[in-house]
Interface confidence: medium
């Protein structure tokens, strides 16, 4: 019951995560004008990684797309490609994780692959998290890194002969949604990544069992209950149930059932 | 080419009230606040208020609040302002004037409106 | 209110000289500082934004400069068609306000 929890919680998480992802990447303020000081009169600049905008005094916004790839920094092309390659992972997750889920029943899916597919879908809730962060973080440093710039240039003008004001810019709206949202998605495939855990001993006492009533001697090795758990000499005919979907490192980093006791 | 063609000359009654109007062109209308400014015959400037036609929002400065009344038609691109009430201290010649961010950019030729018995 | 102090009223100059009106703001308006020019009988021309900013088409005899509460504008080498009055306006909030003009003369 506790695994179907952490599970469900974490796909849940992971798509509210993967929505946020979505929504910050299409979103226009990743960075706004800073305002300190700035007259009533003023317009409001601020920009996205695929236009910008002007919002006027009286309100009338306009934005404008980048009609150029080439022309772009090189930055801002990174970051979009975190972005879309967070997306495209945490979109494939999010459809390797349903069929996953263990209150969803696909035909005779045996519980061993619906482990490795929560396993698999975390790893990439995890990916896509990781992108997101890295993404928005990217953006945030070479916000930070201009903002002080320009803050520089503003007092010191050009030898101090010119009085030049730049428009600085600061955090957006977007990069607090990518954060969070990258956060939460990256929490979504740990949870997803515990609930494997989780999966992969119960299927293995069950297929013990049965195992054992098809008439096949069991080889006990000193170790407690290791030898009952799959974790010991039985890992190796535990892979003829298991498909080879994984690794004897893989199986063998998993806990047994009664850790969650 | 940014264009505000203000209605003509106005001689009007003390007591009266005035409508003097300002088409805008050149540019889209609701984009930009219209602002109105009066100058006295030899004197200098003075902000009257402005009209937003994005959102049909006015404000006016204390000192014209109940004296003028700012409007738009969006489908004329025209702002109008009412001054009612007239005195002698109202003679004077009333500009529209096009603010782009705190500068303003465009101005009307104006409209001289003359109060007298 | 922003109070904007202009100064002189009125001021004579020769052809080619330089001259400076100065604008001084009640509180700071940081750079928000618009210069105008009037002709008798027109309507104001914008000469400076932002302090120091030249407006498209003006000559370049014109400069300002300033930032805070006191402002400067600078015209070099006087020209016959300079003869105008002069309007500092701050756009740092509302009302907007208007400095009382100085009126140049020729000399």
């Known amino acids: 019951m506790a695994v179907t929890a952490c599970q469900g919680l974490g796909f849940v998480v992971s798509l509210i995560g993967i929505a946020g992802i979505i929504a910050a990447t299409c979103m226009d303020q990743w960075s706004t004008q800073d305002l300190y000081n700035n007259p009533v009169t003023a317009v409001f600049n601020y920009q996205g990684l695929w236009r910008s905008c002007v919002r006027e005094s009286s309100g009338f916004t306009e934005c404008r797309g980048y009609f150029t790839l080439l022309g772009l920094p090189a930055m801002l092309q990174a970051v979009r490609a975190l972005m879309i390659v967070g997306i495209v992972l945490g979109a494939i997750g999010l459809l390797v994780s349903i069929f996953a889920l263990k209150c969803i029943r696909i035909g005779s899916m045996e519980d061993s692959a619906k482990a490795n597919m929560t396993l698999t879908s975390g790893i990439m809730f995890i990916v896509s998290g990781l992108c997101a962060i890295a993404g928005v973080s990217v953006f945030a440093n070479m916000l930070v890194t201009n903002f002080w710039m320009s803050t520089a240039n503003m007092y010191t003008g050009m030898g101090g002969m010119v009085q030049t004001v730049q428009t600085r810019y600061t955090f957006g709206a977007a990069l607090f949604v990518g954060w969070v949202a990258g956060g939460l998605t990256l929490i979504g495939g740990v949870m997803m990544c515990i609930a494997c855990r989780g999966l992969a001993p119960e299927e293995t006492n069950y297929k013990a069992v049965s195992y054992h009533a098809s008439g096949h001697s069991v080889a006990y090795k000193p170790g407690g209950f290791k030898a009952s758990t799959g974790f010991g000499s039985n890992t190796k005919n535990k892979k003829i149930y298991d498909g080879g979907a994984r690794t004897e490192d893989e199986v063998q980093s998993y806990p047994s059932k009664h850790d969650y006791v | 080419e940014v264009q505000l063609q203000q209605s003509g000359p106005e001689l009007v009654k003390p007591g009266a009230s005035v409508k003097m109007s300002c088409k805008a062109s050149g540019y889209t209308f609701t984009r930009y606040i219209m602002h109105w400014v009066k100058q006295k015959p030899g004197q200098g400037l003075e902000w009257i208020g402005y009209?937003?036609?994005?959102?049909?929002?006015?404000k006016t400065s204390e000192k014209f609040k109940g004296k003028a009344t700012l409007t738009s038609d969006k489908s004329s691109s025209t702002a109008y302002m009412e001054i009612n009430s007239l005195t002698s201290e109202d003679s004077a010649v009333y500009y529209c004037?096009?603010?782009?961010?705190?500068?303003?950019?465009?101005w009307g030729q104006g409209t001289l409106v003359t109060v007298s018995a | 209110d922003i109070q904007m102090n202009q100064s002189p009223s009125s001021l004579s100059a020769s052809l080619g000289d330089t001259i400076t009106i100065t604008c001084h703001a009640s509180?700071?308006?940081?750079?928000?500082l618009s210069w105008y020019q009037q002709k008798p009988g027109n309507f104001p021309k914008l000469l400076i934004y932002?302090?120091?900013n030249l407006h498209t088409g003006v000559p370049s005899r014109f400069s300002g400069s300033g930032s805070g509460t006191g402002f400067t504008l600078t015209i070099s080498s006087l020209q016959p068609e300079d003869i105008a009055t002069y309007y500092c306006q701050q756009g740092q909030s509302y009302p907007l306000t208007f400095g009382a003009g100085t009126k140049l003369e020729l000399k």
């Open positions: 509180q700071n308006i940081d750079v928000w």
């Open positions: 004037a096009k603010l782009r961010q705190e500068r303003i950019a465009y």
């Open positions: 932002k302090a120091s």
């Open positions: 009209f937003n036609p994005y959102n049909d929002d006015s």
